[in-house]
């Protein structure tokens, strides 16, 4: 899959938007790893 | 509101370097990537590269390695694009963009700066 | 480098047409594909992101559509603030690239 700095942002969003928000607060794009997907 | 203020236009001499600045607000400047674009006159965006401003961290298009430096300025939440040994070539207008999920999901850019190099 | 075509470098339409304005990558980028739209003088303005989805505040006027190598951007109801260029981007792969662009003028 693509692991992108770009890409990674949308599967947060996406992952963000599936889970309600309810996620640690620092699970951002710079932070996380393609491997956290 | 989500804002990424560039610095204002250049006018340099060939050989030179210019630093152009990209200063954001509205967001948590570290939690996102930010891109940096080059639009020449009268054609389409070139992607330069990214910075990941939580570590430094970038990503180049192989085409500006030598040519640009993508670095940040946590403490100002400011993104900077240094560029060396300036030819005509590089008279363009240069973006800064990022994509935001917090507070808004959106992909913003920056107003443009334009760079001319001339003697 | 992905190699992102788009063949029809100016599209004419009058108001209230449909127009699609299409893009080709060279090798396969999944839905990993970007719409802009630029008006004169300035900054581009992102509209759709992974293919087909609209971001917030784009008018559901703008249709996205396509995966691998084939892409089209869909415009309903054409109004005239659509006089612009509409540029697409792979993301897929790095470096992203972006198509040359499609200049959308109103008859």
């Known amino acids: 899959s693509c692991n992108t700095a770009t890409c990674v942002t949308h599967r947060l969003a996406g992952l963000l938007s599936r889970s309600g928000g309810v996620v640690k607060d620092n699970f951002v794009p710079t932070n996380v790893g393609s491997e956290a997907f | 509101e989500v804002q990424l203020q560039q610095s204002g236009p250049e006018l340099v001499k060939p050989g030179a370097s210019v630093k152009i600045s990209c200063k954001a607000s509205g967001y948590t400047f570290t939690d996102y990537y930010m891109n940096w674009v080059k639009q020449s006159h009268g054609k389409s965006l070139e992607w330069i590269g990214d910075?990941?401003?939580?570590?430094?961290?970038?990503h180049y298009n192989q085409k500006f390695k030598g040519k640009a430096t993508l670095t940040v300025d946590k403490s100002s939440s400011t993104a900077y694009m240094e560029l060396r040994s300036l030819t005509s070539e590089d008279s363009a207008v240069y973006y800064c963009?990022?994509?935001?999920?917090?507070?808004?999901?959106?992909?913003?850019w920056g107003q443009g700066t334009t760079l001319t190099v001339s003697s | 480098d992905i190699v992102m075509t788009q063949s029809q470098k100016f599209m004419s339409t009058s108001v209230g047409d449909r127009v699609s304005v299409t893009c080709k990558a060279s090798?396969?980028?999944?839905?990993?594909v970007a719409w802009y739209r630029q008006k004169p003088g300035q900054s581009p303005k992102a509209l759709i992101y992974s293919a087909s989805y609209r971001y917030s505040g784009v008018p559901d006027r703008f249709t996205g559509s396509g995966s691998g190598t084939d892409f089209t951007l869909t415009i309903s109801n054409v109004q005239s603030e659509d006089l612009a260029d509409y540029i697409c981007q792979q993301y897929n792969y790095y470096p992203y690239t972006f198509g040359g662009g499609t200049k959308l003028e109103i008859k």
């Open positions: 963009a990022s994509i935001t999920i917090v507070p808004v999901y959106f992909d913003f």
């Open positions: 910075v990941n401003p939580n570590n430094g961290g970038t």
């Open positions: 090798q396969n980028v999944g839905p990993n």
